[in-house]
């Protein structure tokens, strides 16, 4: 498992090319999904086939901003949705207490460097209780694919490690020890420690979220400025697991 974590973390270290040629990335989404009224649903997007650095992900419903995950500032949820929207898993978004009014198009907008903006579309249909039982099936292809990819990668790594161990047992010992130490170090990130490239972490400079401790004029200015955003951070979102 440590090897897996290390591999995923290492993906985030890939250097983006200096000049953008063509946008090669693709966004896989959960597609058209349906869910039960009163229930919850996970909106998931996955950016792949690019080495571009993800700097921010916006979630929008039609032209309304639901949430932002910023590499420096962490998660921020719109005030009109803060009781019903939860960040994650990953860069996804969880919608709770669904109503029929939640039916519609949702967009994940990946801001990347140097490629630019990638947009994924999900159509959500909120159904009355009994009709929605088949809804979860729509999510299986993407989540299954992601899980399968991880399993394949982990298996490949384990096989390679096992074979290499047989051939070069002594050398692997020292290398593995070193990697294990690095891996353990990454599991112990603290807010004061520099975060790895692409991780979406709450910035130390703004511990109370985008408003900081200035609850008055500055927050009012930000609310007016953004119309829809509530500036309280909701923790971390990891970009480095996202590009494949």
């Amino acid at each position: 498992m440590r090897w897996c974590l290390l591999l995923i973390w290492a993906q985030g270290l890939r250097q983006a090319p200096l000049a953008s040629g063509m946008m090669t990335g693709t966004i896989e989404t959960t597609g058209n999904i349906s869910a039960e009224k009163g229930g919850s649903i996970i909106l998931q997007c996955h950016l792949s086939s690019t080495t571009a650095q993800v700097t921010q992900v916006n979630w929008e419903q039609q032209d309304q901003l639901l949430a932002i995950c910023n590499a420096d500032l962490g998660w921020h949820i719109s005030p009109s949705f803060k009781d019903r929207v939860a960040p994650g898993p990953g860069l996804g978004l969880t919608l709770q207490s669904l109503t029929v009014n939640d039916t519609g198009e949702y967009f994940c907008i990946y801001h990347t460097y140097p490629d630019g903006t990638y947009t994924g579309r999900i159509f959500l249909e909120v159904l009355e209780s009994s009709v929605a039982e088949h809804g979860a099936r729509f999510q299986i292809p993407l989540l299954g694919a992601m899980a399968a990819t991880l399993v394949v990668i982990c298996t490949a790594v384990i096989v390679v490690v096992a074979l290499t161990r047989k051939k070069k047992a002594l050398r692997i010992h020292s290398v593995e020890g070193d990697l294990r130490r690095k891996s353990a170090g990454q599991e112990e990130w603290s807010p004061s420690a520099p975060s790895p490239p692409g991780s979406c972490v709450q910035a130390e400079a703004a511990p109370a979220g985008l408003c900081g401790e200035q609850r008055g004029e500055d927050c009012a200015e930000l609310h007016d400025y953004f119309n829809v955003l509530s500036y309280r951070s909701l923790g971390n979102c990891s970009f480095f697991t996202e590009t494949g």
Epitope: S20, N70, L73, P114, A206, L210, G212, D218, L222
Partner: antibody
Framework: DVQLVESGGGLVQPGGSRKLSCAAS????????MHWVRQAPEKGLEWVAF????????YYADTVKGRFTISRDNPKNTLFLQMTSLRSEDTAMYYC????????????WGQGTSVTVSS | DVQITQSPSYLAASPGETITINCRAS??????LAWYQEKPGKTNKLLIY???TLQSGIPSRFSGSGSGTDFTLTISSLEPEDFAMYYC?????????FGGGTKLEIK
């Protein structure tokens, strides 16, 4: 009120250096990405450099890459542009601008500071 | 880089009229185009971003439309204070690029 005030401009010789500053007030500086944009005499606007709120992302225009360095001091609410190996074509009015939180559009601009590169 | 061609470069109109300014991108920039107003002695002002979203505090006579490569800024019922320089900027991808500008003058 959001305010951005640039300083540090002036006359510089070709090959010389200059450091521009942008003092920000009226908002939580550490939460916003910042841009430098310039405008040569009788010309249009040209984006120069960008730095994200926590300095994790820094980008430059090809015309200044390797010569200019953008940085920020969040506790002091100040943005910087260190310019080296200056050329006559760098002569321009330099503006700092705040990035919107959601997109790379620039929602507040300073008045600008003038840099003239000439011998 | 994305080239932005702005037209016309010069426009004369009278207060009360409706005018349009166009920007064309050399490749698709989705909806990510912003419009700015530049006036002597004042700081540049963001009018529209993401193609059609009105920036807070900007009068509703300003509107933006378009997506892909073709975008339009419309100012309906021109006010005396609207006569200024206008620029468009793509904020879709690095490096961010501007149009050449449109000077709007009183006829």
């Amino acid at each position: 009120d959001v305010q951005l005030v640039e300083s540090g401009g002036g006359l510089v010789q070709p090959g010389g250096s200059r450091k521009l500053s942008c003092a920000a007030s009226g908002f939580t500086f550490s939460n916003f990405g910042m841009h430098w944009v310039r405008q040569a005499p009788e010309k249009g606007l040209e984006w120069v450099a960008f730095i994200s709120s926590g300095s994790s992302s820094i980008y430059y225009a090809d015309t200044v890459k390797g010569r200019f360095t953008i940085s920020r001091d969040n506790p002091k609410n100040t943005l910087f542009l260190q310019m080296t190996s200056l050329r006559s074509e760098d002569t321009a009015m330099y503006y700092c601008a705040r990035m919107r939180l959601d997109y790379y559009a620039m929602d507040y601009w300073g008045q600008g500071t003038s840099v003239t590169v000439s011998s | 880089d994305v080239q932005i061609t702005q037209s016309p470069s010069y426009l004369a109109a009278s207060p009360g009229e409706t005018i349009t300014i166009n920007c064309r991108a050399s490749k698709s920039i989705s909806k990510y185009l912003a419009w700015y107003q530049e006036k002597p002695g004042k700081t540049n002002k963001l009018l529209i971003y993401s193609g059609s979203t009105l920036q807070s505090g900007i009068p509703s006579r300003f509107s933006g439309s378009g997506s892909g490569t073709d975008f339009t800024l419309t100012i309906s019922s021109l006010e005396p204070e609207d006569f200024a320089m206008y620029y468009c900027q793509q904020h879709n991808e690095y490096p961010w690029t501007f149009g050449g500008g449109t000077k709007l003058e009183i006829k």
